[in-house]
Structures are given as structure tokens and as C-alpha cells.
């Protein structure tokens, strides 16, 4: 939902978390605000307190249950409201009928590890975290490798158009320090976006053997 300088954006991690950001220019910094979730076919309601993340934006996480519990499905609609304290009452600032599986952003991949490393190549694996079983294999990944003297923004993106939780990096330089990141996105959902990047995995290629061509 957008109106002038106000915006209310939420994403579902596919299991038990809805993360929301509320931004409004000129809003009072010390105002107490919260997000309230009211599902259309569930018996629970949930609230989280919006905390400032910048001069004019606030964020919070609606924790719907245990991290790996499947709290919502493709048919659920959750009415989300931003409520801010105004004197003695709570004023509704923003409202939306949120379709969780149209607004997905998964957790960053975890457990990155080097499976095998050589002079010119490195095999890396990872795991997805708190991803719904509904996706089956309908996920894609992007990966990037940080080379010496470059920035993450300059790193070319490697696209994996299937649920493949490993990659073999090739044409690497021997005895060189690299970093690697990966992110994940379900194929489902009109407003679905990429997960955050994983924590970087640092690795070093093996030195070239003395007296041999490299």
C-alpha cells in the first residue's frame, strides 16, 4: 500500500514469520506503533511492535509460531494493520489484505560449507532455512563470488534455475582468498522477492603445485 510518502510492505517467509516495514515521511519518532495481523480463517491474531530502522521507517516481525511450523497456506488472507498511538486511542495508519504466498521472501540460505577445493575450482553447498514444503522443487538461487580487489556489487551473478543446493565454482586463481554468497527465491507469488544474501563463506584455493603448469 502506497500513498504519497507512506508505504506499508510485508513479506511472508513461507512458514511462521511475516516481516513488515512501515515508512512515513514527517512521522513523529517517539510515536508508538504496531502491526496487527488478523487472518480470515485462523483463530489466532498476532501483534508486533514497530521499531525504528531509519529516520522515517519502522520494522517488525510477526512471529506466528515455531520457526518450522506451517502457519499459513495459499488460500489464507491476513488483514494487516499499522496502528499508531494518538493520544488515548490507536489510529489505523495503513491497512492491507495480505496474501502470504503472493508476497514471499525466504530466509537467507544457511550452513554454507566448502565440500571440496582445488587450485582452480571449489565445490560449495548450502541449505535453505524455514522454507515451506509446498514449494517442492520450485525454487531458484543466485550466487556471487567476491574476488580480491573487487566489491560485491561488481561480482557477476550466477543463476541456478532449479532447487540445487550446491555449486562448482571454476576458473578460480590458485592460492587466492575468495568469499561466496547465495540467495533463494520461490517461483510462486506476484510480489515475491529474493531472500537476503547468506552470510559470506570465505575460502582459499589451493596453491599451484611447484613445477607444474597452471
Amino acid at each position: 500500500a502506497v500513498n504519497g510518502t507512506s508505504q506499508f510492505t510485508c513479506f511472508y517467509n513461507s512458514r511462521a514469520n511475516i516481516s513488515c516495514v512501515w515508512s512515513q515521511d514527517g512521522a513523529l519518532q517517539d510515536t508508538s506503533c504496531q502491526v496487527h495481523a488478523w487472518p480470515d480463517r485462523r483463530r489466532w491474531n498476532q501483534t508486533c511492535e514497530l521499531l525504528p530502522v531509519s529516520q522515517a521507517s519502522w520494522a517488525c516481525n510477526l512471529i506466528l509460531g515455531a520457526p518450522d511450523s506451517q502457519k499459513l497456506t495459499t488460500v489464507d488472507i491476513v488483514t494487516l494493520r499499522v496502528l499508531c498511538r494518538e493520544g488515548v486511542r490507536w489510529r489505523v495508519m495503513a491497512i492491507q489484505d495480505f496474501k502470504p504466498f503472493e508476497n514471499l521472501r525466504l530466509m537467507a540460505p544457511i550452513s554454507l560449507q566448502v565440500v571440496h577445493v582445488e587450485t582452480h575450482r571449489c565445490n560449495i553447498s548450502w541449505e535453505i532455512s524455514q522454507a515451506s514444503h509446498y514449494f517442492e522443487r520450485h525454487l531458484e538461487f543466485e550466487a556471487r563470488t567476491l574476488s580480491p580487489g573487487h566489491t560485491w556489487e561488481e561480482a557477476p551473478l550466477l543463476t541456478l534455475k532449479q532447487k540445487q543446493e550446491w555449486i562448482c565454482l571454476e576458473t578460480l586463481t590458485p592460492d587466492t582468498q575468495y568469499e561466496f554468497q547465495v540467495r533463494v527465491k520461490p517461483l510462486q507469488g506476484e510480489f515475491t522477492t529474493w531472500s537476503p544474501w547468506s552470510q559470506p563463506l570465505a575460502f582459499r584455493t589451493k596453491p599451484a603445485a611447484l613445477g607444474k603448469d597452471t
Epitope: 500500500a1 506499508f8 488483514t79 489505523v92 495508519m93 495503513a94 491497512i95 489484505d97
Partner: nanobody, 126 residues
């Protein structure tokens, strides 16, 4: 502040029609969705219909679907409720409401609305 003034209520025979109007004045630039609620003494106020800022979205309570139509003329700062095939159970005070909340829902509740009119009485006789 926003002021809302309703008109068009009255006494009508069952099966008849009425058109309610709600004129908004004041800080109307802040208004987004508008709605009609109704209240019978001793009962909770209930949503009849709501309409989005641009008129592109609307929602109705089940019991009035196909009989009532909500519309909006932003050039006149007015919202209308056309009520056809009226029934005795439609008898109530009809109240106009406006909200500053951005966005839209099919599940509006009374606390979503910041501004309220005084209401206009609609009586449907059998």
C-alpha cells in the same frame, strides 16, 4: 478535521428505493476509503458498504449485495448509497464514515475509521 453530513433518509415502503448522500468537507485531501455503516438501537454498528479513494474497489455486507450500490464523486466530495428493493430489516440509522488509513481491505471494522457523520434515519415499512 473532516466533517461528514448525510442526507436522503426517510420512510419508504418495502420494495422501494432510497439514495443516501454523504458530503465531506474540511481536510478532505487526507481521506482515503469511505463507508456506510448502519445501527439499530441496542445493536452494534455494522458495515453496509465501503469504497476506495478512486472508486475502483468496493465491498458490501452479504445481506445487501445486489440491492445496494456505493459510489463516489470526488469532484463533489460526496459518497452515495443507492438502496433498492428495501426490506423492513434494513431499517436503521445509516452513518457515513471516512478513514485516513492508506490501503484497502475487504474487512473494514469501525475502528478503522477516523471521521463519522451524525447519521440519517431509514425506515422501511411492511
Amino acid at each position: 478535521e473532516v466533517q461528514l453530513v448525510e442526507s436522503g433518509g426517510g420512510l419508504v415502503q418495502a420494495g422501494g428505493s432510497l439514495r443516501l448522500s454523504c458530503a465531506a468537507s474540511g481536510s478532505i485531501f487526507s481521506i482515503n476509503a469511505m463507508a456506510w455503516f448502519r445501527q439499530v438501537p441496542g445493536m452494534e454498528r455494522e458495515l453496509v458498504a465501503a469504497i476506495s479513494r478512486d472508486g475502483g474497489a468496493s465491498v458490501y455486507r452479504d445481506s445487501v449485495k445486489g440491492r445496494f450500490t456505493i459510489s463516489r464523486d470526488n469532484s463533489k466530495n460526496t459518497v452515495y448509497l443507492q438502496m433498492n428493493t428495501l426490506k423492513p430489516e434494513d431499517t436503521a440509522i445509516y452513518v457515513c464514515a471516512a478513514t485516513r488509513a492508506i490501503g484497502w481491505t475487504a474487512r473494514w471494522i469501525t475502528t478503522d475509521f477516523d471521521f463519522w457523520g451524525q447519521g440519517t434515519q431509514v425506515t422501511v415499512s411492511s
